[in-house]
Interface confidence: low
């Protein structure tokens, strides 16, 4: 089944704005920082700070730049060839299973465990059992079992059943 192009799948309002540069595609592809025109004859530059493309491509329009969420810091801005780089704020991390949000790092390890890894923007603190050295699965312990690694008392637990 071949790919079919119809007018409704093209972007009629995506014509080059006056400030956008044009060049010719090479073997049907446009370089990073550009997208291809509707007729396939021109490469049109992405708009700095608004959109980008990272590879040689035949995209009909550039990718929209990511806006860092609240709770994130911008490490580097969006350019025409590279998306914004966002990172979780200090004390929070982005988990592989839920990459859409930054989660608070735990303040300490459960009783009988020691901290061997700090909170980073991409990982929670790491805890291992004192005796065996095996890693903790990551379930949050009941509050009274928490050994805090910073001063202050842990927050009160919600009513726990079971």
């Amino acid at each position: 089944e071949s790919a079919l192009i119809t007018q409704q799948d093209l972007a009629p309002q995506q014509r080059a704005a006056p400030q956008q540069k044009r060049s010719s595609p090479s073997e049907g592809l446009c370089p990073p920082g550009h997208h291809i025109s509707e007729d396939g004859r021109d490469c049109i530059s992405c708009k700095y700070g608004q959109d980008y493309s990272t590879h040689w491509n035949d995209l009909l329009f550039c990718l929209r730049c990511t806006r860092c969420d609240s709770g994130e810091v911008e490490l580097s801005p969006c350019t025409t060839t590279r998306n914004t780089v966002c990172q979780c704020e200090e004390g929070t991390f982005r988990e592989e299973d839920s990459p859409e949000m930054c989660r608070k790092c735990r303040t300490g390890c459960p009783r009988g465990m020691v901290k061997v890894g700090d909170c980073t923007p991409w990982s929670d603190i790491e805890c291992v059992h004192k005796e065996s050295g095996t890693k903790h699965s990551g379930e949050v312990p009941a509050v009274e079992e928490t050994v805090t690694s910073s001063p202050g008392t842990p927050a009160s637990p919600c009513s726990l059943s079971g």
Partner: nanobody, 122 residues
């Protein structure tokens, strides 16, 4: 609102074939890349194959010879023909589309279907 609906998953024996389909609908102005990703239990979601509006394809290395992606821009569908399936292909398969909604100037790459389970087992 944009919806992506997958179909075609199921249980198949090793060496068998399946054809996954995904249809995009809703307030769509245009679609750039469409693709298939998969997520096995305990693993990260990974690209299987993607296809541009003009039919240029990109496959994960391990699937290049066994899988074929195709699309119909008029119907706004993308298909994944999977042959010579192996137990390690067992995963939830997700359709992804880079969509520009009507009345907007950008497309967003984060439209996903709900996923369809593919199980390869004897």
């Amino acid at each position: 609102e944009v919806q992506l609906v997958e179909s075609g998953g199921g249980l198949v024996q090793p060496g068998g074939s399946l054809r996954l389909s995904c249809a995009a609908s809703g307030s769509i102005d245009s679609i750039n890349n469409m693709g298939w990703y998969r997520q096995a239990p305990g693993k990260q979601r990974e690209l299987v194959a993607e296809i541009t509006p003009r039919g240029r394809t990109n496959y994960a290395d391990s699937e290049k010879s066994r899988f074929t992606i195709s699309r119909d821009n008029a119907k706004r569908t993308v298909n994944l023909q999977m042959n010579s399936l192996k137990p390690e292909d067992t995963a939830v398969y997700y359709c992804n589309a880079e969509v520009r909604e009507r009345g907007t100037s950008w497309y967003r790459p984060d439209y996903w279907g709900q996923g369809t389970q593919v199980t390869v087992s004897s």
